[in-house]
């Protein structure tokens, strides 16, 4: 922390400008009025201050606003935002999407920092839900943002916001997250026709139940293998060979290359070998002819 010393004669800053880069840290502390800094924060961005000088400027703002900065200052923080700690940010009340965008821009191209995560958390909590405009903004800066949320947090995403989600935004989502997002997507896209619906819902299908996959198999969707491999194993297992053939269409041939991987491997083990042979792909490992299959889980449920 910089010692309190009187400002040398003639050095009192009348405005925030480039002459301040020639000030030593103690001179900045002594000669820059915090209220002046707060009203001219937008100028700081255009001046190549050292990180040490930025520390002094931040200290002055902290003294002026011990309870947290007002949004008028936050919006113009620019690269001073990188000096903020999550504890600083928790004191803020950020309500404007423009402010959020301005601060995300500062961190653009970098991984999501703890500061950014805290900022987003404060913003979303302040809004009460993850609305479409916010989601649009966040996924534009951080394609993986959606998958960084817990299932509980995802439950606050309204179905209307799902329109903002791009396939790449879901790349790192796990099944628990897709379980929450899929019903919302189904609701959001329910009024679309078959082929358009499939294009939109495809990235969310990792959360789809068996009955929805059965319904899709009746619609000539030609699901690609990459999508099929991301389906829930428990949703794929009850599908018949005929249903999988209809679901995949011409892509059914790709099953051979994936026969050792889930969910294909587990699905093969549940099918009659006779039925698998009808595909003509040489898939092995099905239930031999003449064997009786007992579904023990069903029996346990009944007893």
């Amino acid at each position: 922390e910089v010692e309190k010393t009187a400002c040398p004669s003639g050095k009192k800053a009348r405005e925030i400008d480039e002459s301040l880069i020639f000030y030593k840290k103690w001179e900045l502390e002594a000669c820059v009025d915090a209220a002046l800094l707060a009203t001219q924060m937008d100028r700081v961005n255009a001046i190549p201050f050292t990180y040490e000088q930025l520390d002094v400027l931040k200290h002055k703002l902290d003294e002026l606003y011990p309870q947290g900065y007002p949004e008028s200052v936050i919006q113009h923080l620019g690269y001073l935002f990188l000096k903020m700690s999550p504890e600083d940010i928790r004191k803020w009340n950020v309500t404007s999407l423009e402010t959020l965008k301005a601060l995300l821009e500062v961190n653009k191209g970098h991984e999501m920092s703890p500061q950014v995560a805290t900022l987003i958390d404060r913003f979303v909590k302040g809004r009460g839900q993850l609305d479409k405009d916010t989601l649009d903004t966040l996924t534009a800066f951080y394609p993986g943002y959606l998958c960084s949320l817990s299932p509980e947090e995802l439950s606050s995403v309204p179905p209307s916001s799902i329109w903002a989600v791009r396939p790449q935004d879901l790349d790192t989502c796990d099944p628990r997250q897709l379980d929450v997002l899929y019903p919302k997507a189904r609701l959001a896209f329910q009024n679309m026709n078959g082929s358009e619906y499939f294009v939109k819902i495809q990235s969310f299908l990792g959360g789809a139940p068996t009955e929805d996959l059965k319904a899709l198999s009746q619609q000539n969707v030609s699901m690609d293998l990459a999508t099929f491999m991301k389906l829930r194993t428990d949703a794929v297992l009850p599908l018949t060979v005929a249903e999988v053939q209809k679901l995949l269409g011409p892509h059914v041939e790709g099953l051979k290359a994936e026969e050792r991987h889930r969910p294909v491997r587990d699905w093969i083990l549940r099918q009659r070998q006779d039925d698998l042979d009808t595909l003509g792909l040489g898939l092995q490992g099905g239930i031999p002819n003449g064997y009786l299959v007992l579904d023990l889980s069903m029996q346990e449920a009944l007893s």
């Epitope: 480039e18 961005n45 255009a46 001046i47 190549p48 201050f49 620019g78 690269y79």
Partner: nanobody
């Protein structure tokens, strides 16, 4: 995306050096540039400044009349011409770029060493 300084070296008192600050991976046109120096064990201090257009320049009192800052946007480079060098000018010189017009990016170079002895 980085700034690379060059032109430093060992020079006798009264001699001259010309430092260069070249941008790699981005265009300097929209950036104000500052030259800073840090002597061993001392605080880093501002030496010179040039606006993005080149229309405005500024200098620390200790170098006024001896140092001249200029820019060649076509070459994506800013220069610091240092004349009448003194032993107290010794230090590591680095340049910094700050974005104007709401561009929040800022870049620092690694520095080039100047020894006046």
């Amino acid at each position: 995306l980085q700034l690379v300084e060059s032109g430093g070296g060992l020079v006798q008192p009264g001699g001259s050096l010309r430092l260069s600050c070249a941008a790699s991976g981005f265009t300097l046109d929209y950036y104000a540039i500052g030259w800073f120096r840090q002597a061993p064990g001392k605080e880093r201090e501002g030496v010179s400044y040039i606006s993005s257009s080149g229309g405005s320049t500024n200098y620390a009192d200790s170098v006024k009349g001896r140092f001249t800052i200029s820019r060649d946007n076509a070459k994506n480079t800013v220069y610091l011409q240092m004349n009448s060098l003194k032993p107290e000018d010794t230090g590591v010189y680095s340049c910094a770029a700050a974005g104007c017009y709401g561009n929040s990016s800022r870049y620092w170079g690694q520095g080039t060493s100047v020894t006046v002895s």
